[in-house]
Interface confidence: low
């Protein structure tokens, strides 16, 4: 339905608080280097303008599209050219090209300092002095570091952030109350950002058909009692919401997400018995709850799929008449029966089924040709099952840190051209799959593990796209979304790689090592491990373990010494020499 003024429509739908929050997020995700104050000024100007349009929708410029209004506002930033370089050229374009141009310049790895957490008393004072500014600063800092963060969900995080401070700044032990909550928000936020980044990559790189297939599979697992027509409707609406958010249309996205939540809560009987507790919550919490809702119980009497998809003589006729609907139906029926499969596996099975029909429906005896199609699924199912089993056994044997190290070695050998910080970040996150998924019951392990790995590998793909260095990474990232993980799993030692020259500087450490947190120490050691593998890609596990054990002993010894710096200066070169000898 059309409105005379789009900006007035969204302001009225969302309310001033959410409107301002979303505009701040949008601007911060586009202009990631701009200072906070600059963004607040722009947001205030847009808000005042929106209010004039609410008062009179026929007022000057109120009929302009949101892209035009926001783009015009961004292009008023005086330092655009010096801060962003060629991004300033976007301002010479007309909509919709200008918005596309801004989107292309979003930086997944912006050169921003890590966020340092001040003392609790300092934070509480800032919160009490100016709560509104404090919360805006949170939105700004998260959005600029995560330019694809799901905007309406970020408002939910901000609400939780506010609640944590409101509660804990009055507590007897502020730190004990606040710090665990902030840690939880940080970890959940990073996970949420990475999950959304995969959704946007899926839409942007593989199109909405790929996203819709993902959504059919996931929603069918969550809502196995819902019928196909219902799942299809939810998929269509969800695709619109994510297309908008990934495209920078944050006001429309938040508005449509609220409509979807309303629809789901009004139609619970047709969707899932699990929605009830979500639907009593306020909007932001409700939408979050619906997105995270557990799978409903599977209907007890589901018949075999073979009747409709293998044994029926009408398979090819049905497929030919409506390929996407027929495949969608197959995916729905398979997914609702298999909450124990990862979404990516379900999509591989649908792809295999489609390939079989394409081949067999052109054969002399189609039925004979596709009669064994379900048997062909077995190796596809067993591959991730075995992978999860082996890696969980390894995780249980080694613990998280050493499991991460095993993955660091494995991935550095596969793709040694990738930058060391990226290999460390990605392998550390791959390693977290153990603690996240291996403790779960068997039926939940594969969906947890493989779908989490897809999110982490997407981060590798996104970072690699910015600075491509490996043909193998490009191939795995671009050929097939659903086969990314198997593609990376199948990579072997890169025989063509010319080992990196040894650089003593890389293995020189100082007394500041001793004051680092446990996590920072791990990252230092893991950085050294990656560099070792890049220097000696054919080093055995035993050789690398020996070097890393010596490294840990050397650091521990020097951190206990009275003159730490002198110890590092003396023992460091010995460690380097011993390592070179061990790896020779």
């Amino acid at each position: 339905d059309t409105h005379k003024s789009e900006v007035a429509h969204r302001f009225k739908d969302l309310g001033e608080e959410h409107f301002k929050g979303l505009v701040l997020v949008a601007f911060s995700q586009y202009l990631q280097q701009c200072p906070f104050e600059e963004h607040v000024k722009l947001v205030n100007e847009v808000t005042e303008f929106a209010k004039t349009c609410v008062a009179d929708e026929s007022a000057e410029n109120c009929d302009k599209s949101l892209h035009t209004l926001f783009g015009d506002k961004l292009c008023t930033v005086a330092t655009l050219r010096e801060t962003y370089g060629e991004m300033a050229d976007c301002c010479a374009k007309q909509e919709p090209e200008r918005n596309e141009c801004f989107l292309q310049h979003k930086d997944d790895n912006p050169n921003l300092p890590p966020l340092v957490r001040p003392e609790v008393d300092v934070m509480c004072t800032a919160f009490h002095d100016n709560e509104a500014t404090f919360l805006k600063k949170y939105l700004y800092e998260v959005a600029r570091r995560h330019p694809y963060f799901y905007a309406p969900e970020l408002l939910f995080f901000a609400a939780r952030y506010k609640a944590a401070f409101a509660e804990c700044c009055q507590a007897a032990d502020k730190a004990a109350c606040l710090l665990p909550k902030l840690d939880e928000l940080r970890d959940e936020g990073k996970a949420s950002s990475a999950k959304q980044r995969l959704k946007c990559a899926s839409l942007q790189k593989f199109g909405d058909r790929a996203f819709k297939a993902w959504a059919v599979a996931r929603l069918s697992q969550k809502f196995p009692k819902a019928e196909f027509a219902e799942v299809s409707k939810l998929v269509t609406d969800l695709t619109k919401v994510h297309t908008e958010c990934c495209h920078g249309d944050l006001l429309e996205c938040a508005d449509d997400r609220a409509d979807l939540a309303k629809y789901m809560c009004e139609n619970q009987d047709s969707i899932s018995s699990k929605l009830k507790e979500c639907c009593d919550k306020p909007l932001l919490e409700k939408s979050h709850c619906l997105a995270e809702v557990e799978n409903d119980e599977m209907p007890a009497d589901l018949p075999s799929l073979a009747a409709d998809y293998v044994e029926s003589k009408d398979v090819c006729k049905n497929y030919a008449e409506a390929k996407d609907v027929f495949l969608g139906m197959f995916l729905y029926e398979y997914a609702r029966r298999h909450p124990d499969y990862s979404v990516m596996l379900l999509l591989r099975l649908a792809k295999a089924y489609e390939a079989t029909l394409e081949k067999c429906c052109a054969a002399a005896d189609p039925h004979e040709c596709y009669a064994k199609v379900f048997d062909e699924f077995q190796p596809l199912v067993e591959e991730p099952q075995n992978l999860v089993k082996q890696n969980c056994e390894l995780f249980e044997q080694l613990g998280e840190y050493k499991f991460q190290n095993a993955l660091l070695v494995r991935y550095t050998k596969k793709v040694p051209q990738v930058s060391t910080p990226t290999l460390v970040e990605v392998s550390r996150n791959l390693g977290k799959v153990g603690a996240k998924c291996c403790k779960l019951p068997e039926a939940k392990r594969m969906p947890c593990a493989e779908d989490y790995l897809s999110v982490v590998l997407n981060r590798l793909c996104v970072l690699h796209e910015k600075t491509p260095v490996s043909e193998k990474v490009t191939k795995c990232c671009t050929e097939s979304l659903v086969n990314r993980r198997p593609c990376f799993s199948a990579l072997e030692l890169d025989e063509a790689y010319v080992p990196k020259a040894f650089n003593a500087e890389t293995f020189t450490f100082h007394a500041d090592m001793c004051t680092l947190s446990e996590k920072e120490k791990q990252v230092k050691k893991q950085t050294a491990l990656v560099e070792l593998v890049k220097h000696k890609p054919k080093a055995t596990k035993e050789q690398l373990k020996g070097v890393m054990d010596n490294f840990a002993a050397f650091v521990e010894k020097c951190c206990k010494a009275d003159d730490k710096e002198a110890c590092f200066a003396e023992e460091g070169p010995k460690f380097v020499a011993a390592s070179q000898a061990a790896l020779a």
């Epitope: 009692k225 209907p299 589901l302 029926s312 009408d314 006729k317 609907v325």
Partner: nanobody, 115 residues
């Protein structure tokens, strides 16, 4: 948009007959198996009967076997359920679904069998 609209329900004496229809739109009707499902007051949905896309293969719940007949007219994009020898326990809202689902996705049509 996928739409299913049921009709033909009503009040009938025990032993009587009714014929339910389900008009489909928004998808290739002939490509999909269809089912009839019913929900009695205060109870969960119960699968009644199913038919494949071509109309050759039909299946029935034990409680309706021999009394109900499912059929379809793909040219008219319509699914039917002929209900004979109706009993009070057949009283429910009847609705059609795509595939083998037992979830309510449409408004349904009320069937009331009085004794």
């Amino acid at each position: 948009e996928v739409q299913l609209v049921e009709s033909g329900g009503g009040l009938v004496q025990s032993g009587g007959s009714l014929r339910l229809s389900c008009a489909a739109s928004g998808f290739t009707f002939g490509s999909f198996g269809m089912s009839w499902v019913r929900q009695a007051p205060g109870k969960g949905p119960e699968w009644v009967s199913a038919i494949d896309g071509g109309g050759a293969d039909t299946r029935y719940a034990e409680s309706v076997k021999g009394r109900f007949t499912i059929s379809r007219d793909n040219a008219k994009k319509t699914l039917y359920l002929q209900m004979n020898s109706l009993k009070p326990e057949d009283t429910a809202v009847y609705y059609c679904t795509i595939g083998q689902s037992t979830s309510r996705g449409s408004q349904g049509t009320q069937v009331t069998v009085s004794s």
